[in-house]
């Protein structure tokens, strides 16, 4: 199985300049137990919660969030109402944290592209990228060489193409520069976008005992499953100016369900320290 990824896209509504929508999605084989959307930074690290979405229990949202909803089984959207005249959302970072089993929690952040026109952001378009799986097979140097070669190949192919496939329509005054991003390849991300930063940390979840009402009850998601080590995965485009941070750790806050009687999955938030909160959906 490939490394899970989280994508974040922030859009300004063309019709209402004071309305913004944050779209987030999880690309991975696991079951999503909880999604937390925050602004001003990652959840639990200076960010303020805007919404918490549970796949079955419902959603909770707080101003300026207007409506949080599931768009698919692995993606959500959050509509925001900007009451201020100065439109503070334009310069704000929005973060989405997905708690999933068995991966743990993954978080990405993004913001409105600096000079984007209202309504310009197209929906995230999947593009093939080099999978993190290759790193284990070829080694880091092999991956980097392959990545560079792949980038050169893309650049050469782009030269011969008069109209780039990912460009918005010509009627827009500014075309978004889009880029793919592979979560475990910091060098590639830096090449693509100076704003992109990567923060990966892994902390395994340990399953004490199988829960009779646990993960099996949640449907698996229709995320792309690689066929083999060299299979490519679908990663949405991130508009220029996006800040990306993916963390393969485990929720110590909004991803956890408070303890309850009965067996379940134990989470160790930082691979040490006391037993974290437990709860069904991997966080009992």
């Amino acid at each position: 199985a490939g490394t899970p990824e989280v994508w974040v896209q922030v859009q300004m509504e063309a019709t209402e300049l004071s309305s913004f929508t944050v779209h987030c999605g999880f690309l991975g084989p696991g079951s999503i137990s909880l999604v937390t959307v925050s602004w001003g930074g990652p959840d639990g690290a200076g960010g303020t919660k805007l919404a918490v979405l549970h796949p079955e229990l419902g959603t909770r949202q707080w101003a300026p969030a207007r409506q949080a909803r599931w768009e698919t089984q692995s993606s959500i959207s959050l509509a925001l109402e900007d009451s201020g005249a100065s439109s503070p959302f334009a310069n704000t970072t929005f973060c989405c944290k997905f708690a999933s089993f068995p991966e743990g929690s993954w978080e990405s952040c993004g913001s409105l592209p600096p000079s984007s026109d209202p309504g310009l952001s197209a929906p995230p378009t999947p593009v093939p990228i080099l999978r993190a799986d290759l790193a284990g097979i070829l080694g880091l140097s092999g991956v980097l060489l392959f990545g560079c070669g792949y980038l050169l190949h893309l650049l050469r192919r782009q030269k011969h193409r008069p109209t780039p496939r990912l460009q918005p329509s010509h009627t827009n005054s500014q075309a978004l520069t889009a880029q793919a991003w592979a979560p475990s390849q910091a060098s590639q991300a830096a090449l693509h976008d100076p704003y992109a930063t990567i923060n990966t940390s892994f902390c395994p979840a340990t399953l004490d005992t199988a829960h009779p009402n646990g993960w099996a009850s949640l449907p698996t998601h229709a995320a792309h499953q690689p066929q083999g080590p060299a299979a490519s995965a679908s990663t949405p485009i991130l508009a220029r100016g996006s800040f990306v941070s993916v963390e393969n750790g485990l929720y110590t806050q909004a991803g956890e369900r408070p303890p309850h009687t009965g067996p379940g999955l134990t989470l160790f938030p930082d691979c040490r320290g006391p037993r974290a909160l437990e709860g069904r959906f991997g966080v009992r």
Epitope: P55, E56, L57, A63, R69, W70, A254, P258
Partner: antibody, heavy 114, light 113 residues
């Protein structure tokens, strides 16, 4: 084990205010909202509103807006609900709840009587 | 606000028999995005707070006996107790978990015949 422990019963005069507390333990207090629900004698359940501890973000049932105030103290893991301008019809058991109503306090009976 | 209407208001069923409680919402509780119905069922015994039984219309809460089951979609939902036990005597509430404000049905009182 998650526990929500509420303050004791109160008897209040019409026009006065009451402040009910709800002390949470067994989970990260700031992670989930504390919901407030009331139940008049022999009646059904009525959602009053919620507060997200930490950010103190709130949502109120329109019916109670202007009369109810939610606060939360993260240092003591305690949430508070204050209801003002009490009327006899506010006589009810007031519950705090968390995690989408999966966990509940034992309830606080507030009696409004002259 | 979404209005939740339960039927019947009260119900008397013999021990070991099936009990069925219906709940109708004034708006659909189905989220088309993930095809989930945001409806919960609670059991409340005298002098106690409500207890979550079912969420997502059909998912049983941990520790809830499997004689309790939930079904339905959109605006019509059902709570079924396949074989009534003495300890099931209580008031049962359905709840809209789809949109603000969370609203509850008026309750159905279940007794033993």
């Amino acid at each position: 084990e998650v526990q929500l422990v509420q303050s004791g019963a109160e008897v209040k005069k019409p026009g006065s205010s009451v402040k009910v507390s709800c002390k949470a333990s067994g989970y990260t207090f700031s992670s989930f909202s504390i919901e407030w629900v009331r139940q008049a004698p022999g009646q059904g359940l009525e959602w009053i509103g919620e507060i997200l501890p930490g950010s103190n973000s709130t949502n109120y049932n329109e019916k109670f807006k202007g009369r109810v105030t939610f606060t939360a103290d993260t240092s003591t893991n305690t949430a508070y609900m204050e209801l003002s301008s009490l009327r006899s019809e506010d006589t009810a058991v007031y519950y705090c709840s968390s995690y989408w109503f999966a966990y509940w306090g034992q309830g606080t009976l507030v009696t409004v009587s002259s | 606000d979404i209005v939740m209407t339960q039927s019947p208001d009260s119900l008397a069923v013999s021990l070991g028999e099936r009990a069925t409680i219906n709940c109708k919402s004034s708006q659909s509780l189905l989220n088309s995005g993930n095809q989930k119905n945001y409806l919960a069922w609670y059991q409340q015994k005298p002098g106690q707070p409500p207890k979550l039984l079912i969420y997502g219309a059909s998912t049983r809460e941990s520790g809830v006996p499997d004689r309790f089951s939930g079904s339905g979609s959109g605006t019509d939902f059902t709570l079924t107790i396949s074989s009534l036990q003495a300890e099931d005597v209580a008031v049962y509430y359905c709840q809209n978990a789809h949109s603000y404000p969370p609203t509850f049905g008026q309750g159905t009182k279940l007794e033993i015949k």
